[in-house]
C-alpha cells in the first residue's frame, strides 16, 4: 500500500478500487463487480454501479400525470449484464433462465420469459419524472428559487447539461423534476439523464455514490431541503410490451 | 488519508499583499474542487474564493471580488490564494477545503455545509 496509492480516488463512484497504473502513472479505477475501468471526471453508468452493488457485502394542475407508459422500477436489485460501454445489455437473464427485456435505464419492460426471449434492441428512457414529497417547512418554498437551486445541482453535481432539465414543478410538498434526452440529443461526453437520476435517488436516500464522506447537502435559500419520499417514473421512446394480464392485476 | 495543509498567513498592513498555499494529498486532487474559506473572531465562517477541478471555473465572494486571486496547480496538488489591497475586514483564520463530489455545486455556492475534508487553517492579520 503505497503513498501514490492513498493518493489515487474516485469522486463520482466510490465503488471503486484505484491505482496509479495508469499512463504516465495517472490514477486509474476499476468498478467493482465488473472490473471495468471508469472515467472519474463524470458519472459511472447505472449498470456498473448496480453490478458494482450487487457484488458488494450485503449489509396537481401544473404536476405532471404519468403516461399510461410510464415505468416503475418494482423489481428493485439485481446483478445485471452491462455492454463493453457500460450499458444495460438489451436482455437480462437472471441465474434460474428467467430472461426479460429492459430500457436504458435498467427497468423491466416485457414479461419476464425463458431464455428463447428475444430483445432486439436497448429501448432508450427519453423522459424521466423524478416526483418528490418534502417534508413539512414553515413555508413553502420560493418556486423559482427551487428551480433555480435543482437545476444548478444537475448542472454541478450530476454534470447534466441544462438542456436535458426540461421542467421543474412544484406544488407544495410535491416537487417533480422532468429529465428529456432524446437519442439524437445526447452527444459524446454528455452525461445520461438515467444515469443522473440515479446519482440524484441515491443522494435523496442517503447512500451518496461520491467519494465524501458527507451525503448530499440540499438547500434552498439556505433552508434546508429534505425529501420523505420519492418516486421515479420512466418514459421510453418505444412503449412497453406487456400482457394485458399484467396491467389489469 | 485525505490531508489540506495551509500556509502564508501572517501580519500584513493595510493595502499589503499575502499568498496563501493550500497543499493537498490522499486524494486525486485534479478532480476536485477545492475552497477558501475565513473565520474572523465572533462571525460564522464564510466562503472565500473556489475552483472548480476539471475545467478551472473560479468563484469569489462579492467581499473580495477585483482583490484575491484564486489558482491551481496540479502538477504540485496545490491551489493558491493571492490577497492583494487587504482590508482590516479581511483579518480571520484562512481554511481550505475540498468537497468529495468533485463537482462544482457546493463550490460555485462557496457554502461550507457541503465541504467534507478541511485543514486545519492559517491566520491573516491585517493591522497598521
Known amino acids: 500500500h503505497t503513498a501514490a496509492q492513498d493518493n489515487c480516488t474516485c469522486p463520482t463512484n466510490k465503488m471503486t478500487v484505484c491505482s496509479p497504473d495508469g499512463p504516465g502513472g495517472r490514477c486509474q479505477c476499476r468498478a467493482l463487480g465488473s472490473g471495468m475501468a471508469v472515467d472519474c471526471s463524470t458519472l459511472t453508468s447505472k449498470c456498473l454501479l448496480l453490478k458494482a452493488r450487487m457484488s458488494a457485502p450485503k449489509n396537481a394542475r401544473t404536476l405532471v400525470r404519468p403516461s399510461e407508459h410510464a415505468l416503475v422500477d418494482n423489481d428493485g436489485l439485481y446483478d445485471p449484464d452491462c455492454d463493453p460501454e457500460g450499458r444495460f445489455k438489451a436482455r437480462q437473464c437472471n441465474q434460474t433462465s428467467v430472461c426479460w427485456c429492459v430500457n436504458s435505464v435498467g427497468v423491466r419492460r416485457t414479461d419476464k420469459g425463458d431464455l428463447s426471449l428475444r430483445c432486439d434492441e436497448l429501448v432508450r428512457t427519453h423522459h424521466i419524472l423524478i416526483d418528490l414529497r418534502h417534508r413539512p417547512t414553515a413555508g413553502a418554498f420560493n418556486h423559482s428559487d427551487l428551480d433555480a437551486e435543482l437545476r444548478r445541482l444537475f448542472r454541478e453535481r450530476y454534470r447534466l447539461h441544462p438542456k436535458f432539465v426540461a421542467a421543474v414543478h412544484y406544488e407544495q410538498p410535491t416537487i417533480q423534476i422532468e429529465l428529456r434526452q432524446n437519442t439524437s440529443q445526447k452527444a459524446a461526453g454528455d452525461v445520461d439523464i438515467g444515469d443522473a437520476a440515479y446519482y440524484f435517488e441515491r443522494d435523496i436516500k442517503g447512500e451518496s455514490l461520491f467519494q465524501g464522506r458527507g451525503g448530499l447537502d440540499l438547500r434552498v435559500r439556505g433552508e434546508p431541503l429534505q425529501v420523505e419520499r420519492t418516486l421515479i417514473y420512466y418514459l421510453d421512446e418505444i412503449p412497453p410490451k406487456f400482457s394485458m394480464k399484467r396491467l389489469t392485476a | 488519508q485525505v490531508q489540506l495543509l495551509e500556509s502564508g498567513g501572517g501580519l500584513v498592513q493595510p493595502g499589503g499583499s499575502l499568498r496563501l498555499s493550500c497543499a493537498a494529498s490522499g486524494f486525486t486532487f485534479d478532480y476536485y474542487a477545492i475552497g477558501w474559506f475565513r473565520q474572523a473572531p465572533g462571525k460564522e465562517r464564510e466562503g472565500v474564493s473556489c475552483i472548480s477541478s476539471s475545467h478551472g471555473s473560479t468563484y469569489y465572494a462579492d467581499s473580495v471580488k477585483g482583490r484575491f486571486t484564486i489558482s491551481r496547480d496540479n502538477s504540485k496538488n496545490t491551489v493558491y490564494l493571492q490577497m492583494n489591497s487587504l482590508r482590516a475586514e479581511d483579518t480571520a483564520v484562512y481554511y481550505c477545503?475540498?468537497?468529495?463530489?468533485?463537482?462544482?455545486?457546493?463550490?460555485?455556492?462557496?457554502?461550507?455545509?457541503?465541504?467534507?475534508?478541511w485543514g486545519k487553517g492559517t491566520l491573516v492579520t491585517v493591522s497598521s
Open positions: 477545503a475540498t468537497a468529495g463530489d468533485g463537482g462544482d455545486y457546493h463550490c460555485s455556492g462557496l457554502v461550507d455545509y457541503g465541504m467534507d475534508y
